[in-house]
């Protein structure tokens, strides 16, 4: 005698995050008298997800209507999908029973797969300016996508990376994964305006990756380099001396003047100009009033860099000599001092 | 649907009613029989499924057997009493979200010595 | 097992009449719902007219209709017309398959 078969005809389907998952399934009979249920798993932990006869299922829908007569479609849909949904789903055949209705025929299942996007890429970069010749390290970070096959890379300034390390968690079966890589990359002092890219590719963003940037203006920092300079007379007993600032970035900046050693003027780097690569120029200058020294005197520009030791260079000013014209190179070459840096 | 096999019989001897169908499947619905003594109400006596989806009320239970074939739906009075004199009726369905319908016109069963 | 109780057993009204049949189970009825109301005429099989306590079956005029749920279930006629003075069974179903029992019966006649 033929009896009832509970028929799921999709052994598997496929479903965006958000999206809408029909489940179908149909009975052969109307006999036994009882209640189709819906299951996620199988077993005794296994999840009700719909129950004909009672409950309050809110995002699911049946597709026909169960009150009807003679219906034999029991297919449900599940409403705004996320990754926690994905498993295999059975449809069974209770037969009406005292004090409780009796399982009497289960589905074969249908495995719910559910396609979620990756978050946006988040990168980060180190702590810690570096500079120069420094390697440093950035990280990105992607979470939430299904299935877990997924595609990152890694470029500067649009030229792709290779130094890099990536791993996709958990590495057995889940509802989402997450993707975690660590790139390494050389700074140059050209990289102020200079950008890190992390490219996700996966097959629920169709073709078009998803991007996270970092600027390595935040990550670098270009020490400046000094040079002090001696002016022509500008009064009979007057000599201005500049020190001139050149390619630092941040701006953040402290210069202090000494005259012998002795702290002469400090000020902070304001009107300053910017170079085509982003770093950026400064220039001080001091007046000193020969007259006022009976004994040669030397002159220290010393700059404090974002926070870092300080650096310097000093200028030898004879006050015997008449003063004249110095050239581009620093007083301390010309008259054999030496040159100060002080970490 | 439709009864036939109702006649008058005596106490004791088995009596088969058929209820013939057409327009639907027997492996898909049930046939529920409920009778009617004259001049009382309805009295449901049972379903006839698959062989392991029969089933009696409790107080038809080895008074009355039931049988398939693939149009046809047996009932049978194992052993009738006077009380099981009445208008006995097939019909499509088992209860619940398949309830009776439609109903055959019924056929008579008289139990008398 | 279950036992339905259906009231009035008979009552006389006039067409056009708003009519009211109570029906009550000594338990609820399976899902809570598992309750049909039946219309008898002398001489011929009953009919299908409410299922589900309160689905409209095929073809049944939209005066009829059905509410309760549980134990206390009742069929309503709207607007009395001639050709439904009859006799009115409720049918419950317990929570055992074979426990399917009908009420006694209400016959509505005509004033």
């Known amino acids: 005698e033929e009896e009832l078969q509970v028929i799921q005809p999709d052994k598997s389907v496929l479903v965006a995050a958000g999206e809408t998952a029909t489940l179908r399934c149909t009975a052969t009979s109307l006999i036994p008298v009882g209640p189709i249920q819906w299951f996620r798993g199988a077993g005794p932990g296994r999840e009700l997800i719909y129950n004909q006869k009672e409950g309050h299922f809110p995002r699911v829908t049946t597709v026909s209507d169960l009150t009807k007569r003679n219906n034999m479609d029991f297919s449900i849909r599940i409403g705004n999908i996320t990754p926690a949904d994905a498993g295999t789903y059975y449809c069974v055949k209770f037969r009406k029973g005292s004090p409780d209705d009796v399982e009497f025929k289960s589905g074969a299942g249908t495995e719910l797969s559910v396609r979620a996007k990756p978050s946006a890429p988040v990168v980060s970069g180190p702590a810690a300016r570096a500079t120069p010749q420094h390697t440093v390290s950035f990280t990105c970070e992607s979470h939430g996508f299904s299935p877990r096959d997924i595609t990152l890379k890694w470029f500067k300034n649009g030229n792709e990376l290779s130094d890099f390390q990536t791993n996709v968690d958990p590495v057995g079966e889940s509802v989402s994964y997450s993707i975690h890589s660590t790139a390494k990359v050389v700074l140059t002092r050209e990289d102020v305006h200079s950008q890190v890219i992390c490219e996700v590719a996966h097959v629920t963003l169709q073709g078009d990756p998803l991007r996270g940037t970092a600027n390595l203006s935040e990550t670098i920092r270009v020490p400046p380099t000094l040079e002090v300079t001696q002016q022509p007379v500008r009064a009979e007993n007057q000599v201005n001396v500049t020190c001139q600032v050149r390619k630092f970035y941040p701006q953040r900046l402290q210069l202090t003047w000494l005259e012998n050693g002795n702290v002469s003027r400090t000020e902070t780097a304001s009107t300053v100009t910017e170079n085509k690569d982003g770093t950026y120029n400064w220039m001080s200058w001091l007046l000193v009033n020969v007259s006022a020294h009976r004994d040669d005197v030397k002159l220290t520009c010393q700059v404090e860099h974002d926070g870092q030791p300080a650096v310097s260079k000093s200028h030898d000013l004879k006050v015997s000599a008449h003063p004249k014209e110095q050239g581009s190179n620093t007083a301390a070459e010309n008259t054999g001092s030496n040159e100060r840096n002080i970490y | 649907v439709e009864e036939s096999g109702g006649r008058l019989v005596t106490p004791g001897t088995p009596l088969t009613l058929t209820c013939t169908v057409s327009g639907f499947s027997l492996s898909s619905h049930g046939i529920s029989w409920v009778r009617q003594a004259p001049g009382k109400g309805l009295e449901y006596i049972g379903t006839?499924?698959?062989?392991?989806i029969t089933y009696f009320a409790s107080w038809a239970k080895g008074r009355f057997t039931g049988s398939k074939t693939s149009t046809t739906v047996d009932l049978k009075i194992t052993s009738p009493t006077t009380e099981d004199t009445a208008t006995y009726f097939c019909?499509?369905?088992?209860?619940?979200?398949?309830?009776?319908?439609?109903w055959g016109p019924g056929t008579l069963v008289t139990v008398s010595s | 097992e279950l036992v339905m109780t259906q009231s009035p057993s008979s009552l006389s009204a006039s067409v056009g009449d708003r009519v009211t049949i109570t029906c009550q189970a000594s338990q609820s009825v399976y899902g809570n719902n598992d309750l049909a109301w039946y219309q008898q005429k002398p001489g011929e099989a009953p009919k299908l007219l409410i299922y589900?306590?309160?689905t409209l079956a095929t073809g049944v005029p939209s005066r009829f209709s059905g509410s309760g749920s549980g134990t206390d279930f009742t069929l309503t006629i709207s607007g009395l017309q001639s050709e439904d003075f009859a006799t009115y069974y409720c049918l419950g179903g317990g929570d055992d398959e074979a426990d399917n029992v009908f009420g006694q019966g209400t016959k509505v006649e005509i004033k």
């Open positions: 589900l306590a309160s």
């Open positions: 019909a499509r369905g088992s209860a619940w979200n398949d309830p009776f319908d439609p």
């Open positions: 006839i499924g698959t062989g392991v």
